[in-house]
């Protein structure tokens, strides 16, 4: 999972916060000498060696290709850039740079279906053929359709009532007019 490659390289968050609070903002406690505060590395760089004494420079190096740091830090190595997942139909919105991670997203007329905070699938928005759009497709939500008379909602698409089998939920939505119009997007089908 991104971010990756930093486990064990820096103190745990609780320890880090305690130690950081001993120094003014933008500085951190020297890894071997608690009485020295060193300047943190700028975003886009990582820590090579602590400052030898107060007022002397911390040695930082720019992140190599394929890695980044997005904020001031004292990481011993940069974080690995995220790769947009083609198998989830993701596209690259902006490439990884030394100071910012890759931004992945979806093509136009697609929404994001989340698996975890860092993993999502891009899914085509329902076009609502044979119906009208009740709620448009949003970043993380498919279109909500309202089907025309003679159609019912299944798999987020308006399907002809001739496809409705007896005893199915769609029977209610496929009654003869004037009730044919009354379709509820929450009654049947797939999101």
């Amino acid at each position: 999972i991104h971010p990756s490659g930093v486990t064990g390289l820096v103190p745990s968050l609780g320890d880090r916060e305690k130690r950081d609070s001993l120094c003014p903002q933008g500085k951190y406690v020297h890894s071997k000498n608690n009485s020295i505060c060193c300047t943190k590395c700028h975003k886009g760089t990582y820590l090579v060696s602590d400052c030898p004494s107060p007022g002397r420079d911390t040695v930082c190096r720019e992140c190599e290709k394929g890695t980044f740091t997005a904020s001031q830090n004292y990481l011993r190595q940069c974080l690995s850039c995220k790769t947009c997942r083609k198998e989830m139909s993701q596209v690259e919105i902006s490439p990884c740079q030394a100071d910012k991670d890759t931004v992945c997203g979806c093509k136009e007329n697609q929404f994001q279906r989340y698996l975890s905070e860092t993993h999502f699938q891009c899914v085509d928005c329902s076009p609502c053929f044979n119906g009208t759009v009740t709620i448009p497709c949003k970043e993380t939500q498919n279109t909500v359709c309202n089907c025309h008379a003679g159609f019912f909602l299944r798999e987020s698409e308006c399907v002809p009532c001739s496809h409705c089998k007896k005893n199915e939920e769609c029977m209610k939505l496929c009654l003869p007019p004037p009730l044919a119009n009354v379709t509820n997007p929450q009654d049947s089908g797939t999101a």
Partner: antibody, heavy 115, light 113 residues
Framework: EVQLVESGGGLVQTGKSLELSCEAS????????MNWVRQAPGKGLEWVAY????????YYGDAVKGRFTISRDNAKNLLFLQMNNLKSEDTAMYYC????????WGQGTLVTVSL | DIVMSQSPSSLAVSAGEKVTIGCKSS????????????LNWYQQKPGQSPKLLIF???TRHIGVPDRFMGSGSGTDFTLTINSVQNEDLADYYC?????????FGAGTKLEIK
Amino acid sequence: EVQLVESGGGLVQTGKSLELSCEASGFTFSNYDMNWVRQAPGKGLEWVAYISSGSGHIYYGDAVKGRFTISRDNAKNLLFLQMNNLKSEDTAMYYCSGSYWFAYWGQGTLVTVSL
Amino acid sequence: DIVMSQSPSSLAVSAGEKVTIGCKSSQSLLNNKDQKNYLNWYQQKPGQSPKLLIFFASTRHIGVPDRFMGSGSGTDFTLTINSVQNEDLADYYCLQTYSFPYTFGAGTKLEIK
């Protein structure tokens, strides 16, 4: 850390109602589709209900359709299951599960429907 | 409704052996739009909640050991556990999310000899 915590289960008589809640934390709740799944004692898993991230799409299992209502409050990171006209066969452990792929699960809350 | 038939209902193997669990659906789970099979596999250890192992029939979820492998397409799917470990003692379920109502298989109880 992702957490889903179900509550509201307990012993209830046939024909009565009960509302289950699921509190989510550690992830962006409003981005995720959510589900309720149940498991009768010693039995397998049964899907109960689904709600999309923005509540625009809602679906139910055949066994609960017309009796159960799924809803969510994205501002409070809460998922609900309103269960009416309970039957003895609704006795089960009820789990809330997050993501379209059921990637996150709570520990469950036990609902016992007595005659 | 799509019916999911899982087999066997139980099996007992020794640690280190290979395990194969089958799942058949009453209709194809292959989505023609994205060419993905909407079939997931879950593991439920005794007294615990289920855990996602595999989605899209063959994609391992984050953190799942690579001894767990999913395969198959259309209506026939397989979960393979290569070199079973003692901690793999659990019930295993397949689930179709191709269409509503979603349906689980009846489960396979894996016991370690």
